[in-house]
């Protein structure tokens, strides 16, 4: 769950409360069991621009 | 304010040895992949060794042309990351950054050390 | 491993032009959901700076001048209005699998 008081992360980002900052959720492919990662699995990811 | 600071480096003889430190500060250091890239003209950028995390017993990984020669190693008390180089040959040759990544892209560099191996 | 090829080796763009460096890896880097591939610029004497991660997501700092784009194997990055301050060697890097390798770099140098 994201820390009280701070901005949302942006769109393809989790919060994590171990590293205390919004994470990418595309990091998530090598390191699955991360803080954050369970916030990115409800959350779209960032489209590609193509 | 994110910081790697290198020690180590030299001049060195082809079968010789040689031990390259980093110290970091600034960020959770036992949370991230700590990881040695060298930089030659005939090689250009080279990963070279990466060791991971103490929760999976700090796996390493290295690159085919340093297996068997270079160890990397972490103290995780001490915010610090290891390349020990043995069996040194003159292709080894470059500048050598520590970086850190955690877990696709290197974030941070540190200001690089420059190795020559040459008799 | 996979390998990354970077076009041109040299680039020489006037001030405020469009400067466009190519970026080619010898297998798909992508998800459906991300490309697995950065941007880093080097100045002399420095290490690499990183600019853009996961193909399109500028670091923050990084001015919006700086754009990525791609997916699959092919991958741009383009600097418009190039500055004076963009001098330097550019390189991508992929994060596929192990070894990360980065291509042979793109000099920019300001006609």
């Known amino acids: 769950e994201q820390a009280p008081g701070t901005a949302p992360c942006s769109r393809g980002s989790s919060w994590s409360a171990d590293l205390d900052k919004c994470m990418d959720c595309a990091s998530c492919r090598a390191r699955p069991a991360s803080d954050f990662c369970l916030g990115c699995a409800a959350a779209p990811p960032a489209p590609f621009r193509l | 304010e994110v910081k790697l600071q290198q020690s180590g480096g030299g001049l060195v003889q082809p079968g010789g040895s040689m031990k390259l430190s980093c110290v970091a500060s600034g960020f959770t250091f036992s949370y991230y992949w700590m990881n040695w890239v060298r930089q030659s003209p005939e090689q250009g950028l080279e990963w070279i060794a990466e060791i991971r995390l103490q929760s999976n017993d700090y796996p390493t990984h290295y690159a085919e042309s340093v297996k068997g020669r270079f160890t990397i190693s972490r103290d995780d008390s001490k915010n610090s990351v290891y390349l020990q180089m043995n069996n040194l040959r003159p292709e080894d040759t470059g500048i050598y950054y520590c970086?850190?990544?955690?877990?696709?892209?290197?974030?941070?560099w540190g200001q690089g050390t420059t190795l020559t191996v040459s008799s | 491993d996979t390998v990354l090829t970077q076009s041109p080796a040299s680039l020489v763009v006037s001030l405020g032009q469009r400067a466009t460096i190519s970026c080619r890896a010898s297998?798909?880097?992508?998800?459906?959901?991300?490309?697995?591939i950065h941007w880093y610029q080097q100045k002399p004497g420095q290490p690499p700076k990183f600019l853009i991660k996961?193909?399109?997501n500028r670091d923050s700092g990084v001015p919006a001048r700086f754009s990525g784009s791609g997916s699959g194997t092919d991958f741009t990055l383009n600097i418009h209005p190039v500055e004076e301050d963009d001098t330097a060697i550019y390189y991508c890097q992929h994060s596929w699998e192990i070894p990360p390798t980065f291509g042979a770099g793109t000099k920019l140098e300001l006609q």
């Open positions: 996961y193909a399109s």
């Open positions: 297998q798909s880097v992508s998800t459906s959901d991300y490309s697995y």
């Open positions: 970086a850190c990544r955690y877990a696709d892209y290197f974030d941070h």
